[in-house]
């Protein structure tokens, strides 16, 4: 029997047999020796390079009482769901004594049905937009020819015919499926089956009709969106004057948007309950039964400034000789813009009225003409933007001033309904 | 009886190529890394890189990575090394050596002297 | 890569005398796998192939003089010669092949 002690004098009473299969099967490779003495811890080499994470088991088997008689010692090596990193030449390797020894080899191969290693996707795409789809097969054996099918109707005459790893779409107008068939010289496999959902293409044109200090119109031309009729579009609106900075294509906005839905057609729409003087960005997308495109780029638009929705507030006047003494407060309801500064108007009971713009100042010394006679004097204030004069007060009757009297103060009881200018008197 | 032949000498010219052969025998070829060295007049040994008979699977030194292709003929259970645009610094005795896989025994041919010069 | 170095470069002693070669490896070369030093000695003498003399660290090539031994583990190895004769007479060569190959310069022993 082989003792392994003299110079390339094999131990190895069986090798490694050879393995082909299709992926996924199960083997065992196994290599047998019979050596003098201690046995020796087998190794297993793939393609010359010893397997350091091997599934191997070893089994001993004494021949003899003594240890130094002779051992049968069997190593086997198991790959489980062979794949094609498995394949290659495999010998069993032991160090004896002070020599190396290797066993014939085995070889592993891989040989089946052909095997994808890349499929087609499910997908959205605009209708009427090119698009690619990509499929790769492997074997053995090869060579594998691929023959592509949509809505499970050949794309080619036969398989390798057509388009192989990618498929070019140069658009569709319906929602379809793709799938494709690899082919091989021992048959046929078939991919998973990709469904290419159309959506509606993105609005284009979005733009504003017109505007007011809490309303803005827009309107968007649609696009395509295959045979299936858009249901409605979705606009967003999202303040703007925090600092916020959406980009052209940012995905979402940092806050919750304003979200207006309009049936379509028209394609148009009235946004209302904004703020005035308030710069905004607006976006829409349209859906259809296959769901809804995406949206159009952010689009900055402002609401105009308004007037001031209320009189200033907290009106006093008293007199004092020919002088009287006004001064009053902001109002309290939304100026709508920005504060250009006020108006007041004075009048006696038989004397023209007489009207000054104030500028921001809150107070007014009025020099009174004649000795300050004139009966029944009443002012009345309004604050003003650049889009105009917001309500008048209710006429303030002047009082005459004592010393150590406290002024006398008239609250605003009734704001007038319309900020529509017109003298109070 | 494990035997590893190489030619005694070559003689090429500058900016030439060649191919030089390591004939195996007595063991089988192509269950054994061959790996190739390289020795200039008077200097050390370089390893200039290995193959491995049976995938042809190659391993280079960085540095002869564009100098020296290493390739086998399965049939003739022989290995070959080329180089290619030859210069003076390519002369050198150039060995074959079977690996195994870090242990005893261990098998060198005699050497092949590649001589550059016009 | 892996780089071998070896001390000294040269070195000259009388027949008879004790000799030690280093050579240091820039990593270990132990193969937990195979629990093996993937250090080999080599000695080429003048116009001839290299010789194998030792192998995974410390085992003797089989027909090598017991004079020659191996020692060392991890990254320092060193080379003894008990007792020079003048057949020595050449170039020392360690080698690892841990990961492919790479060999140090060399040590040139010579006889006074």
């Known amino acids: 029997a082989p003792r392994g002690t003299q110079a390339e004098e094999s131990p190895f009473v069986g090798n490694p047999g050879n393995i082909t299969g299709a992926r996924g099967l199960t083997g065992t490779l196994r290599c047998q020796l019979q050596v003098q003495g201690e046995p020796p811890e087998v190794h297993w080499l793939r393609d010359g390079q010893i397997l350091e994470l091997a599934d191997s088991t070893q089994t001993q088997v004494p021949l003899g009482e003594d240890e130094q008689d002779d051992w049968i010692v069997v190593s086997q090596l198991r790959i489980t769901s062979l794949q094609l990193s498995d394949t290659g030449q495999y010998q069993c390797l032991v160090f004896l004594g002070h020599q190396t020894f290797v066993s014939q080899p085995g070889y592993v191969g891989l040989e089946g049905l052909p095997y994808f290693l890349e499929e087609p996707e499910d997908r959205t795409v605009a209708a009427n937009t090119p698009f690619n789809l990509s499929c790769q097969a492997q074997g053995p054996p090869e060579p594998v020819d691929l023959l592509w099918l949509q809505d499970a109707v050949p794309l080619a005459t036969a398989p390798g015919h057509g388009p192989q790893r990618s498929l070019h779409v140069p658009g569709l107008n319906k929602t379809s499926s793709f799938s494709c068939e690899a082919h091989n010289a021992k048959g046929v496999t078939t991919s998973r089956t990709a469904t290419i959902t159309v959506l509606p293409q993105q609005p284009r044109n979005l733009h504003l009709v017109s505007r007011q200090p809490t309303e803005l119109e827009v309107a968007w031309t649609p696009g395509l969106s295959g045979i299936y009729p858009l249901t409605h579009c979705t606009l967003q609106a999202v303040l703007s004057d925090d600092g916020m900075g959406i980009q052209a294509g940012e995905p979402d906005p940092p806050e919750e948007p304003l979200t207006s839905q309009a049936s379509v057609p028209p394609h148009q729409l009235r946004l209302g309950s904004l703020h005035p003087h308030t710069p905004y960005h607006i976006r829409v997308a349209c859906t259809s039964s296959q769901g809804p495109s995406s949206w159009t780029h952010w689009l900055p638009v402002e609401t105009p400034e308004g007037v001031p929705l209320g009189p200033p507030e907290n009106i006093s006047a008293t007199r004092n000789g020919s002088q009287a003494f006004v001064h009053w407060q902001e109002p309290r309801a939304p100026l709508q813009g920005t504060l250009l500064g006020y108006r007041l108007a004075y009048q006696g009971q038989d004397t023209p009225e007489v009207l000054m713009d104030i500028g921001l100042r809150q107070e007014v010394t009025l020099e009174l003409q004649g000795d300050g006679s004139v009966s029944n004097l009443t002012v009345c204030v309004a604050a003003y933007t650049a889009a105009g004069d917001g309500p008048w007060s209710l006429p303030v009757p002047l009082e005459a001033w004592r010393p150590g009297q406290a002024q006398p103060v008239h609250q605003l009881v009734k704001e007038p309904s319309t900020p529509a200018f017109s003298w109070p008197w | 009886q494990v035997q590893l032949q190489q030619p005694g000498a070559e003689l090429v010219k500058p900016g030439a190529s060649v191919k030089l052969s390591c004939k195996a025998s007595?063991?089988?070829?192509?269950?054994?890394?061959i790996n190739w060295v390289k020795q200039r007049p008077g200097q050390g040994l370089e390893w200039i890189g290995n193959?491995?008979?049976?995938?042809?699977?190659?391993n280079y030194n960085e540095k002869f990575k564009s100098k020296a292709t290493l390739t086998v003929d399965k049939s003739s259970t022989t290995a070959y090394i080329q180089f290619s645009s030859l210069t003076s610094e390519d002369s050198a005795v150039y060995y074959c050596?079977?690996?195994?896989?870090?242990?005893?025994?261990?098998?060198w041919g005699q050497g092949t002297t590649l001589t550059v010069s016009s | 890569d892996i780089v071998m170095s070896q001390s000294p470069s040269s070195l000259a002693v009388s027949a008879g005398e004790k000799v030690t070669m280093s050579c240091k490896s820039s990593?270990?070369?132990?193969?937990?796998?195979?629990?093996?030093?993937?250090l080999a000695w080599y000695q080429q003498k003048p116009g001839q192939s290299p010789k194998l003399l030792i192998y995974?660290?410390?085992t003797r090539q089989s027909g090598v003089p017991d004079r020659f031994t191996g020692s060392g583990s991890g990254t320092d190895f060193t080379l003894t010669i008990s007792s020079v004769q003048a057949e020595d007479l050449a170039v020392y060569y360690c080698?690892?092949?841990?990961?492919?190959?790479?060999f140090g310069g060399g040590t040139k022993l010579e006889i006074k």
């Open positions: 050596t079977r690996d195994t896989y870090g242990g005893s025994p261990d098998y």
């Open positions: 007595g063991y089988t070829f192509t269950s054994y890394w």
């Open positions: 193959i491995y008979p049976d995938s042809s699977s190659t």
């Open positions: 990593q270990s070369l132990l193969n937990s796998r195979t629990r093996k030093i993937y």
């Open positions: 995974w660290a410390s």
């Open positions: 080698k690892q092949s841990y990961n492919l190959w790479t």
